[in-house]
């Protein structure tokens, strides 16, 4: 009996948003199965997604243990158990992933405007502090808990009646901006980590406009 045509995985790609982290690869298996292993640079390899025919593996549980560590994964290819093959002894084929440091590389998810409140010519806009899957003392941390002052938000706002946008920035989750009395404004926010070299910005939040349910207007 001959050897099997086991092929090594390729195109190993990290897909990560707000620390929810999936490793994807190709090809779809034919007469083979995969096992993923993950390790930090100094740690032991740990098997995940063992003996699977999937081409993705959720590694969130591992990377959230320390999001500032750098991780490496590898995908092993094994001939399926129903394949009658005999060859000389040989290590299984595997392919290494690129290195991945969650704190520096996870994509920032699309933020959401939680509320806005107008008091006279001031508007307070609050950004929802999204929960992540990172845990400390058995509770899930928010994006702000994890990133602290490394995370800022940029607010884009404009009069409903015009297209000229203004911007404001905050290193909290709240903005206090000046507006013209009697005018309705629309808002959109973006999460930013200025210190990053990659994945610095999120996509823009959905637009929210005054005169809709999210806001509150108080004439003083």
């Amino acid at each position: 009996s001959g050897t099997t045509n086991t092929v090594a995985a390729y195109n190993l790609t990290w897909k990560s948003t707000n620390f929810k982290t999936i490793l994807e690869w190709e090809p779809k298996p034919v007469n083979q199965v995969y096992t993923v292993q993950i390790s930090t640079k100094s740690g032991d390899w740990k098997s995940k997604c063992f003996y699977t025919t999937d081409t993705e593996c959720d590694l969130t549980d591992e990377i959230v243990k320390d999001v500032k560590q750098t991780y490496l994964a590898r995908v092993f290819s094994y001939p399926a158990g129903n394949v009658e093959s005999t060859g000389s002894a040989g290590e299984p084929l595997y392919e290494n992933s690129p290195e991945f440091t969650p704190y520096l590389e996870t994509n920032l998810g699309q933020p959401t405007i939680q509320s806005f409140e107008q008091v006279g010519t001031k508007v307070n806009v609050t950004v929802e502090d999204e929960r992540t899957l990172v845990r400390r003392n058995n509770t899930f941390l928010s994006l702000r808990d994890v990133f602290g002052k490394d995370l800022i938000y940029t607010l884009y706002y404009w009069k409903s009646s015009s297209s000229g946008k203004k911007t404001a920035k905050t290193n909290t989750n709240e903005f206090l901006i000046d507006v013209d009395k009697g005018e309705n404004y629309c808002f959109s926010v973006q999460a930013v980590i200025p210190s990053r070299t990659v994945n610095r910005k999120s996509t823009d939040s959905p637009v929210e406009c005054m005169g809709q349910e999210k806001g509150e207007f108080r004439e003083i």
Partner: nanobody
Framework: QVQLVESGGGLVKPGGSLRLSCTAS????????MGWHRQAPGKGRELVAV???????HYADFVKGRFTISRDNAKNTVYLQMNFLRAEDTAVYYC????????WGQGTMVTVSS
């Protein structure tokens, strides 16, 4: 060529237990998968259980809760503890190790009968 030698098969009554062992003739890397398949009379070979070098396991649905696979990397040995055996577990049980290729033992017969 990796040689795998099984032992522990035999005749057992329904509800009884057996422990199969399989030892490789040479050092098996921890990156190898080791496991067990079985072939009942007149049927094809089917997966029973497999185990990684760091002890992660995968079982066929029909043995979950009854069979336990374990592995001793230092001894190049894999075990299959079989409890609550049923007549339909009667088969030849084959040890296997998978690296770049699959390596199979000669098989050990398990007969469950009253």
């Amino acid at each position: 060529q990796v040689q795998l030698v099984e032992s522990g098969g035999g005749l057992v009554k329904p509800g009884g237990s057996l422990r199969l062992s399989c030892t490789a003739s040479e050092t098996i890397s921890s990156t190898y998968i080791m496991g067990w398949h079985r072939q009942a009379p007149g049927k094809g070979r089917e997966l029973v259980a497999v185990i990684s070098g760091d002890g992660v396991t995968h079982y066929a649905d029909f043995v979950k809760g009854r069979f336990t696979i374990s592995r001793d990397n230092a001894k190049n040995t894999v075990y299959l503890q079989m409890n609550f055996l049923r007549a339909e577990d009667t088969a030849v049980y084959y040890c296997y190790a998978a690296g770049r290729w699959n390596h199979w033992g000669q098989g050990t017969m398990v007969t469950v009968s009253s």
